[in-house]
């Protein structure tokens, strides 16, 4: 159903990384505009991105209120210049999104190695604790704040002079690894949420090697 000059949105897709969350859809509008509504399963609908010609809507501000809730969005289509017009059933044409639970589904962003420090035959590698847009008591929480021990990091490290890799994991943001004295090492990390079934792993961080700026060496 619907008016003759509007089409329903389709391919509604959640795009979310570290809780920055955007709903995307098709088609590009021709003589129509869209409004998005979002709700938790038990909550009221809240309208966002009013009468837009975009095919995306940033819903981060809504989902960060409770990242463990499950959200549903819907996209309404209206004729351009006549947003009061409704479909044949007396209401605007709309399409529902898939359900989305940010805590379980947001993609893990590419991590960054913040620093590494060598003391003798040990190296401490620190992963940057990225800030998210999730707030508590008026402060933004880090990824570790949100996920706690549910989030682990896998470290890959290898001698600059060789291809054989080693690995370690941590449920903090720090690794303490043994290295051979006098050897330079390279490092890369990956974020993982073991308990998930989807979107479990991040892409690898950029490689950082000893002898570059981020490192520090002490005997």
């Amino acid at each position: 159903s619907g008016t003759t000059n509007t089409v329903a949105a389709y391919n509604l897709t959640w795009k979310s990384t570290n809780f920055k969350t955007i709903l995307e859809w098709e088609p590009k509008p021709v003589n129509q505009v869209y409004t998005v509504q979002i709700s938790t399963k038990s909550g009221d609908w809240k309208s966002k991105c009013f009468y837009t010609t975009d095919t995306e809507c940033d819903l981060t501000d809504e989902i960060v209120k409770d990242v463990k809730q499950t959200y549903l969005a819907r996209v309404f289509s209206y004729p351009a210049g006549n947003v009061e017009s409704t479909g044949s059933a007396g209401e605007p044409l709309y399409e529902n999104s898939p359900e989305f639970t940010p805590y379980l589904e947001t993609n893990l962003g590419q991590p960054t190695i913040q620093s590494f420090e060598q003391v003798g035959t040990k190296v401490n590698v620190t992963v940057e604790d990225e800030r998210t847009l999730v707030r508590r008591n008026n402060t933004f929480l880090s990824l570790r704040d949100v996920f706690g021990k549910d989030l682990i990091y896998t470290l890959y490290y290898w001698k600059s002079s060789s291809s054989g890799k080693k690995t370690a994991k941590t449920n903090t943001n720090e690794f303490l690894i043994d290295v051979d004295k006098g050897e330079n090492y390279c490092f890369s990390v990956q974020a993982v949420i073991p308990s998930r079934t989807v979107n479990r792993k991040s892409t690898d961080s950029p490689v950082e090697c000893m002898g570059q700026e981020k490192g520090e060496f002490r005997e």
Epitope: I152, T154, Y156, K165, K166, T167, A168, K169, T170, I177, Q190, V192, P194, S195, T197, V198, R200, K201, T203, D204
Partner: antibody, heavy 117, light 107 residues
Framework: EVQLVESGGGLVQPGGSLRLSCAAS????????MHWVRQAPGKGLEWVGW????????IYDPKFQDRFTISADTSKNTAYLQMNSLRAEDTAVYYC??????????WGQGTLVTVSS | DIQMTQSPSSLSASVGDRVTITCKAS??????LSWYQQKPGKAPKLLIY???SLADGVPSRFSGSGSGTDFTLTISSLQPEDFATYYC?????????FGQGTKVEIK
């Protein structure tokens, strides 16, 4: 249902090569780490190595680094263990296992490799 | 590399007994230790991860304790289906290392 099925085992002469396969179903291997573990007859478990199928990163026990190669084909949802220069002491049941990054939650039934002349 | 020393290598016990198996790491591995049960001709099965967390579907008579270098698997009341070989695994850094195994037999 999650399932891992190893194949490719059999009798091989010392110095020979063999490629084992671990076909996964019920999940996407690129979302996990995949390991190979072996067990010689009447002996304990021995870790061989792992692969992250998404990016190809591999980690080996150093004792296997030179002779064994782990790979994966995400389009076939299969991990592989290529074993070269095989010795009698490589005779074992070879298992693949899925790693969540916290634990090995699913294992295959194993495939027996016998190295003998 | 980390060495895992598991003891005892075998033990005899009766149904209903409390059984304790220990694993000692050659250096601090924090809580990166898991326990597996293996029956003859079968693949290992996860029991405990992160030293103390019970895996899904595993009976509550199994428990794990310890951190750092000393770890324990306890079966509070041994059942007939628990007669098997048990392995600890240090899985926090490579190379991952299994203990030598503990065979739990019927007395």
């Amino acid at each position: 249902e999650v399932q891992l099925v190893e194949s490719g085992g059999g009798l091989v002469q010392p110095g020979g090569s063999l490629r084992l396969s671990c076909a996964a179903s019920g999940f996407n291997i690129k979302d996990y780490y995949m390991h190979w573990v072996r067990q010689a007859p009447g002996k304990g478990l021995e870790w061989v190595g792992w692969i992250d199928p998404e990016n190809g990163n591999t980690i080996y026990d150093p004792k296997f680094q030179d002779r064994f190669t782990i790979s994966a084909d995400t389009s076939k949802n299969t991990a592989y263990l290529q074993m070269n220069s095989l010795r009698a002491e490589d005779t074992a049941v070879y298992y693949c296992a899925r790693d969540t990054a916290a634990y090995f939650d699913y294992w295959g039934q194993g495939t027996l490799v016998t190295v003998s002349s | 590399d980390i060495q895992m020393t598991q003891s005892p290598s075998s033990l005899s016990a009766s149904v209903g007994d409390r059984v304790t198996i220990t694993c000692k790491a050659s250096r601090d591995i924090k809580s990166y230790l898991s326990w597996y049960q293996q029956k003859p001709g079968k693949a290992p099965k996860l029991l405990i991860y992160y030293a103390t967390s019970l895996a899904d579907g595993v009976p509550s008579r199994f428990s794990g304790s310890g951190s750092g270098t000393d770890f324990t698997l306890t079966i509070s009341s041994l059942q007939p289906e628990d007669f098997a070989t048990y392995y600890c695994l240090s899985d926090g850094s490579s190379p991952f290392t299994f203990g030598q195994g503990t065979k739990v037999e019927i007395k």
